[in-house]
């Protein structure tokens, strides 16, 4: 795939480096988890923002309104979470493909079996639109292997 | 992925001394980086995180106003600036890799050999 | 807080390591193996995911406050220091460490 971080997009990266991913990571594991219905106990729970307001003075709320509809009990607080952190890449579809690729390249090693794999792909890929936001068109989703320092 | 570390050696209390970590292998300016240190024959602390772009820095509350982590991507390096150096300083001191591009949210995937400081008169 | 301190097992033994957060930190929890004189190296991350190439005998387990660390038929590479971390929050905390020797 096409790497833009080398092209030196620098206020991407610095968005991408302020956002909190890991509630769309939980959100998404906790839904194909809630789909196969095969996991008992899900071990995620809300949990504190590694950025929250009181390290990063300059962090906005997480918990501030956003443009979507609450749906399933178990990970609301996560998407809501989510939705906050993708809305700040609306602007920007080549970041938003960024931010997605980096959840699927964090949780690649979470995944078992091709199935999962493409579920949580699929997931992910809807996730823009859960949120209210444009999808970015052409965003390869795929994870090479060779790990994460491969660049 | 290579790290390496210098820069230590004995300083007496209140002195400054500026560690380097030059890092090969990967794409340095996309990868958050971090320094932790141990003291001889105890255990590990971490002391301070850095962005790619340099833009965030943390660090843990013992140093906060005497170090200053700081990058310098042209350069693949990371330094740590020490001063008001204190005798609890006394360590090893590594710098570690983040293993997820971007955020200071996930662990350490390749840590340098270390190079020690020494605060003593 | 991680226990025990230090613990001495024969190579073939199962050995296991508690480590206990103070707070809730779901799953971001890791585990480093130290051997003496060398770097840290990763283990397990997420509280339960094997690093690529590290041997199936190391697992980790739990989520929320309490974890687990456990090595199936110990071997003689295994002597080290080994440490957990946590990554939910700063300050990055490690527990204390618990060094593993062959009795």
């Known amino acids: 795939r096409q790497q833009w971080e080398l092209q030196g997009d620098r206020r991407c990266q610095s968005q991408l480096e302020r956002a909190n991913l890991r509630p769309c990571e939980q959100h998404l594991m906790q839904k194909i988890q809630r789909d196969e219905d095969s996991y008992g106990r899900d071990p995620y729970s809300p949990s504190q923002d590694p950025y929250s307001p009181s390290q990063d003075p300059d962090r906005r709320d997480p918990y501030s309104p956003s443009p979507y509809d609450r749906r399933g009990a178990g990970s609301s607080q996560h998407q809501e979470r989510c939705c906050n952190e993708l809305n700040e890449f609306e602007n920007n579809q080549r970041c938003m493909c960024e931010a997605l690729q980096q959840i699927m390249e964090n949780q690649s090693d979470r995944l078992q079996g091709r199935q999962q794999e493409q579920q949580f792909k699929r997931e992910l890929r809807n996730l823009p639109q859960q949120c209210g936001l444009r999808a970015p068109q052409r965003c390869d989703l795929e994870v090479e292997s060779g790990g994460r320092d491969r660049y | 992925v290579q790290l390496v570390e210098s820069g230590g050696g004995l300083v007496q209390p209140g002195g400054s001394l500026r560690l380097s970590c030059t890092a090969s292998g990967f794409t340095f300016s996309i990868f958050g980086m971090s320094w932790v240190r141990q003291a001889p024959g105890k255990g590990l602390e971490w002391v301070s995180s850095?962005?790619?772009?340099?833009?965030?820095?943390k660090y843990t509350d013992s140093v906060k106003g005497r170090f200053t982590i700081s990058r310098d991507n042209s350069k693949t390096t990371v330094y740590l600036q020490m001063k008001s150096l204190r005798a609890e300083d006394t360590a090893f001191y590594f710098c570690?890799?983040?293993?997820?591009?971007?955020?200071?949210?996930?662990?350490?995937?390749?840590w340098g050999q270390g190079t020690l400081v020494t605060v003593s008169s | 807080t991680q226990s025990p301190s230090s613990l001495s097992a024969s190579v073939g033994d199962r050995v296991t390591i508690t480590c206990q957060a103070s707070?809730?930190?779901?799953?971001?929890l890791s585990w480093y193996q130290q051997i003496p004189g060398k770097a840290p190296k990763l283990l397990i991350s997420d509280a339960s995911f094997l690093q690529a190439g590290v041997p199936s005998r190391f697992s980790g387990s739990g989520s929320g406050t309490d974890f687990t660390f456990t090595i199936t038929n110990l071997q003689p590479e295994d002597v080290a220091t080994y440490y957990c971390q946590q990554y939910e929050n700063f300050p990055r905390t490690f527990g204390g460490g618990t060094k593993v020797e062959i009795r």
């Open positions: 850095i962005s790619g772009t340099g833009e965030i820095t």
């Open positions: 707070q809730d930190i779901t799953t971001y």
């Open positions: 570690a890799k983040e293993r997820t591009k971007y955020q200071l949210a996930y662990p350490f995937d390749y």
